[in-house]
Amino acid sequence: AESCTSRPHITVVEGEPFYLKHCSCSLAHEIETTTKSWYKSSGSQEHVELNPRSSSRIALHDCVLEFWPVELNDTGSYFFQMKNYTQKWKLNVIRRNKHSCFTERQVTSKIVEVKKFFQITCENSYYQTLVNSTSLYKNCKKLLLENNKNPTIKKNAEFEDQGYYSCVHFLHHNGKLFNITKTFNITIVEDRSNIVPVLLGPKLNHVAVELGKNVRLNCSALLNEEDVIYWMFGEENGSDPNIHEEKEMRIMTPEGKWHASKVLRIENIGESNLNVLYNCTVASTGGTDTKSFILVRKADMADIPGHVFTR
């Protein structure tokens, strides 16, 4: 079974089939009789309930809200409600690039080292039963491959393999033809040696805060693709609903390494958030590097030398 849509922010391209699947699906089957509702809100409109009568493009199946296809005016916030369970998504529908076979903003980047194993597999598990055929394109030129259900490339990488690979799935629904495109930007690089990952900035940071306010603790590192950056705080990170780990931002450096940044957001700061360690760790198989943040009440700033503060 296809997993639920747990990401709260989603970007999709206009004109393609798309679906949202809520994350209490197994629960929904147990209580068939419970009222289940989908809502949309955008700009001026507050919570409008969705049903197949709202639009001929919308279909509802058990746990799923389907768009056939999704269009620009579908941008907005979507809610699923069942008893005391609510799930929310923010959907951003972007314009299709009419001059290309793919849309730049919806590209997945992959780096492959020369002579290492290189694979492209075209698959789409959710729409699998509806797919008539699938084509694989390189830089928008169709590749002639034997399997037209799940085209695949498996080989040792060469520099000429670099490019944009687009899997285009063609499917029929209610007598109409649709396609779904997934594009990979494949960069072929020389054999790269690993760096020792390092966190940027001081190892101990005292942050001046006010009770009831919010603070964002930013942790940045230089690392390899396979290294990981994470926050550690409290009892296995699960105890404080006011603490949120934001999504990691990664930018590739000219040397083929990564600059990563991960923010810990603490909302409505309370006494329990003061004078405790919030640790950010970058880990590789070669070891770890950790930096610590301590929240200190602004009134207590005078007790700590100025040079240890981050603003």
Epitope: E2, S3, T108, V112, E123, E226, Y230, E248, M249
Partner: nanobody
Amino acid sequence: DVPLQESGGGSVQPGGSLRLSCAASKSIFSINAMRWHRQAPGKQRELVATFTSSGRINYADSVKGRFTISTDNAKNTIYLQMNSLNPEDTAVYRCNVGLWEDGLWYDYWGQGTQVTVSS
């Protein structure tokens, strides 16, 4: 979204072997980095093995030559074969993957599976 489920943990005698599995709920082809971590009580979490989509594999010195990370794309599963186990390998083992989605880097974690090595 890539929920992960580990299995294969358990108790084993020193010198024994175990194979941990980490099943992803969707294709692991789109995953850029696959990792196995471990954490023993009172110790810092340790990254023991990594596998990237570009074909690079790394191991922590403490497990080199004994542990092997591998994948099975058809089964959407990541494995950690652990041989010549010793008591210092006792820990909770968690798999973790990193991938690009909507231009953002996402890390997903499994719940973990307990490995105990004792005579």
